[in-house]
């Protein structure tokens, strides 16, 4: 940007600028061009022997220049234009300034005036243009600083040149008020720092709801002495509610939301949210939506799931398999998991309790993913319940629960009681017993053993009867034991495991039993 | 020295024709804008028309225009004016004049011309 | 066209005397104007151009000045050769028209 502190064309000839010596030499004269009037200041005294004729500007304020720009247009006769070449004459001026506080007025004195250059034209005017009106314009331009008082003069200095000066425009240069990145530049004055740092290093602020972001840089820019904004460094994003329109932040519009400072635009509120009003960071879930903390906002509002489906119990003697099917509705989310739980009551006294700690499940029967689970280590004469509750990344959120219950009934035998018999260096002769009313129930029994320590195998047998010799045994090695009744509806109740151990080859008649 | 002598003056009847002629002699002739002015008896100055150094361009007055052709040759040094259509109020001495710009002192030309030399003058007269 | 008006029409004066003869221009000529004197039955001769510069060759007792639309014709001490009829032409336009004539007479 150009600030202009002197227009002498754009003044049409208003200025009365000081001419000395008074009435000789420069004279302020109107001519057409291009059917336009214009002003200049002339002189063609080419043959009147030596010339000193100066022509100064009016006083003009400095503002905040430090150093000024001085453009000259000006047209230059050719000597040989004249008859004889007129012997005195020249084709160059001189350009002078004087710096000063007060304006002089009419008091003119050459002495306060320090020269800025000799003024050449590129381009003279021969006598062919001349005659056909074809003004060859120069154009120079010449800087003057730093400048220091509050204002200055500029004079020129005839020699003996025909010449017409149509313009003279002083101006300094500034970088102009700037928008970049959402941060707003001041009107800067274009000045070299120094002669090594050509570059004035100007802070950007942040245009209304924008910020700088987190760890980010501030935004700053570069004013060259040229008066152009160079080097952008950092910048400005639109804070949450807003987004960047242009140059500027606008509010979300309503139904739209922004959570945080981005380059992003603002997003339409998503599902089962209520109409969000202007400028909105978040989206308010509808009632009974919810939002996971870690759910991001631009994620739709969910909902707890509802109950898993089809849920039945199939029992097989002790055991009993669960199998259910995905909730209806899964709440709009894809993160459901069930959890089993297990109530165990006594048809005789109707008692009930939780029994968790006495059946054995097939999985961790928390945040299970599959639809199915198998229960085993179930008591005879027991009805039991289980509740299959689906939940996902919002079901923390409610107090309610979605479960479906299945009931069981087990009505296997009990556990036989066992006990050692015999042994031997390499043999355990092992006894068992039922109650008599469910003898009739069992049609074998399965004898599972193995080594203590060694999970790795077993051995069963299967016997009709209530006993059973274990043969082919390591001597003074204890083995773990257990029996099951196998019944027409299954696998009865297992036995608990007992640890029998064979004799040492010293040979010991004590039983572990 | 600048010297200018018209010829081809005489007396016209309205409506007939006549060729001036400027000779020119002890100056550079292509260097001169030429031009022709007229002065009725008794009366002011009036310019009729102008041309260039080396032919163009060529202007003349309102009175005129149509009717009045300004010529020259510069191998011959010779400026024309030829009039057709002549009217009695073109009765007058006609004047051949010339300009250079050499002498005229100034930056920027002036948009039109001043008249720094001049001949005697040849008198037409438009009569029946 | 420009109209040039020039006063007095005629005047009378002595050897001697200061003449200052004006023409006015109907619109503003900056300084594009020339000074001519004719003697009777003689060509016009150039005394100013650019309203104040002396022609070559003319003495310096003619001097011009003025510019806009108001400009005179100074002779400051009239000489017996000076007695003609002076016209102010402007150039300002391609019309160039003359002022009708000042005739300065002996008294």
């Known amino acids: 940007k150009e600030v202009v502190l002197l227009d002498f064309a754009a003044m049409k000839g208003e200025l009365g600028w000081l001419t000395h010596p008074y009435g000789k030499g420069w004279d302020l004269m109107q001519n057409i061009m291009d059917d336009m009037p214009i002003y200049m200041y002339s002189v063609c005294n080419v043959v009147s022997g030596d010339q000193d004729n100066w022509l100064r500007t009016n006083w003009v304020y400095r503002e905040e220049a430090e150093r000024i720009f001085i453009e000259l247009k000006f047209t230059v006769r050719d000597c040989n234009s004249f008859p004889g070449g007129a012997s005195s004459c020249k084709e160059t001026f001189n350009l002078y300034y004087a710096e000063s506080d007060v304006d002089y007025g009419t008091n003119f004195q050459k002495r306060q005036f320090t020269k800025i250059d000799t003024i050449a034209p590129d381009e003279i005017t021969v006598s062919s243009d001349f005659e056909a009106r074809n003004v060859k314009l120069n154009v120079e331009e010449r800087m003057v600083g730093p400048l220091t008082r509050k204002g200055f003069y500029l004079a020129f200095q005839d020699i003996g040149a025909c010449v017409a000066l149509l313009s003279v425009r002083v101006y300094y240069k500034k970088c102009p008020e700037m928008l970049q990145s959402l941060a707003r530049f001041p009107e800067t004055i274009a000045v070299a720092v120094s002669d090594t740092q050509p570059l004035a290093t100007v802070a950007g602020t942040c245009v209304d709801h924008a910020v700088v972001p987190y760890g980010g840089e501030g935004p700053l820019m570069h004013c060259t002495v040229d008066g152009e904004w160079l080097v952008p460094i950092g910048q400005c994003l639109c804070q949450e509610g807003y987004e960047k329109v242009e140059d500027a932040c606008r509010a979300c519009s309503p139904g739209f939301f922004k959570s945080e400072a981005s380059e992003s635009p603002c997003l339409e509120c998503p599902e089962h949210t209520l109409p969000s009003t202007e400028g909105a960071t978040s989206c308010q879930c509808e009632e009974g939506y919810f939002r996971a903390p870690e759910d991001p906002l631009s994620m739709s509002c969910t909902r707890p799931p509802s109950a898993p489906n089809y849920l039945t119990a199939i029992g097989m003697g002790a055991k009993v398999e669960l199998r259910w099917t995905a909730p209806k509705d899964t709440g709009g989310r894809q993160d459901i998991v069930y959890s089993v739980t297990c109530e165990q009551c006594w048809p005789e006294s109707g008692e009930c309790g939780p029994c968790e700690a006495s059946v054995r499940y097939s999985e961790p029967p928390h945040a299970l993913t599959r639809t199915s689970v198998t229960v085993s280590d179930l008591e005879p004469h027991m009805n039991y319940t289980f509740a299959v509750e689906a939940r996902n990344g919002v079901s923390g959120l409610v107090t309610s629960r979605s479960f479906r219950t299945a009931s069981v009934s087990i009505n296997q035998t009990e556990p036989p009681k066992v006990r050692l018999e015999d042994r031997s260096t390499t043999s355990l002769s092992v006894t068992w017993s039922i109650p008599v009313s469910q003898q009739s129930r069992v049609w074998k029994y399965e004898v599972t053993y193995r080594k203590k320590g060694d999970a790795n195998s077993y051995n069963v047998r299967r016997t009709e009867g209530f006993s059973v010799t274990l043969d082919d045994l390591a001597p003074d090695t204890t083995y773990l034991v257990q029996v099951q009744a196998l019944t027409q509806e299954g696998q009865g109740a297992g036995s608990k495991v007992h640890e029998f151990q064979t004799l040492s080859t010293e040979g010991s008649a004590n039983m572990a039993v | 020295e600048v010297q200018l002598l018209e010829s081809g003056g005489g007396l016209v009847q309205p409506g007939g024709s006549l060729r001036l002629s400027c000779a020119a002699s002890?100056?550079?002739?292509?260097?001169?804008?030429m031009a022709w002015v007229r002065q009725a008896p008794g009366k002011g100055l009036e310019w009729v028309s102008r041309?260039?150094?080396?032919?163009?361009?060529?202007h003349y007055a309102d009175s005129v225009k149509g009717r009045f052709t300004i010529s020259r040759d510069n191998s011959k040094n010779t400026l024309y004016l030829q009039m057709n259509s002549l009217r009695a109020e073109d009765t007058a001495v006609y004047y051949c004049?010339?300009?250079?710009?050499?002498?005229?002192?100034?930056?920027?030309?002036?948009?039109?011309?001043?008249?720094?030399?001049w001949g005697q003058g040849t008198l037409v007269t438009v009569s029946s | 066209d420009i109209q040039m008006t020039q006063s007095p029409s005629s005047l009378s004066a002595s050897v001697g005397d200061r003449v200052t003869i004006t023409c006015r221009a109907s619109?503003?000529?900056?300084?594009?104007l020339a000074w001519y004197q004719q003697k009777p039955g003689k060509a016009p001769k150039l005394l100013i151009y650019?309203?104040?510069n002396l022609h070559t060759g003319v003495p310096s007792r003619f001097s011009g000045s003025g510019s806009g639309t108001e400009f005179t014709l100074t002779i400051s001490g009239l000489q017996p050769d000076d007695f003609a009829t002076y016209y102010c032409?402007?150039?300002?336009?391609?019309?160039?028209?003359f002022g009708q004539g000042t005739k300065v007479e002996i008294k």
């Open positions: 004049a010339g300009y250079d710009s050499g002498y005229d002192y100034v930056a920027v030309a002036g948009p039109a011309e001043y008249f720094q030399h």
């Open positions: 002890g100056f550079t002739f292509s260097h001169y804008m």
């Open positions: 041309i260039g150094p080396s032919g163009g361009p060529t």
């Open positions: 619109q503003s000529i900056s300084t594009w």
């Open positions: 650019k309203a104040s």
């Open positions: 032409q402007q150039y300002n336009s391609y019309s160039r028209t």
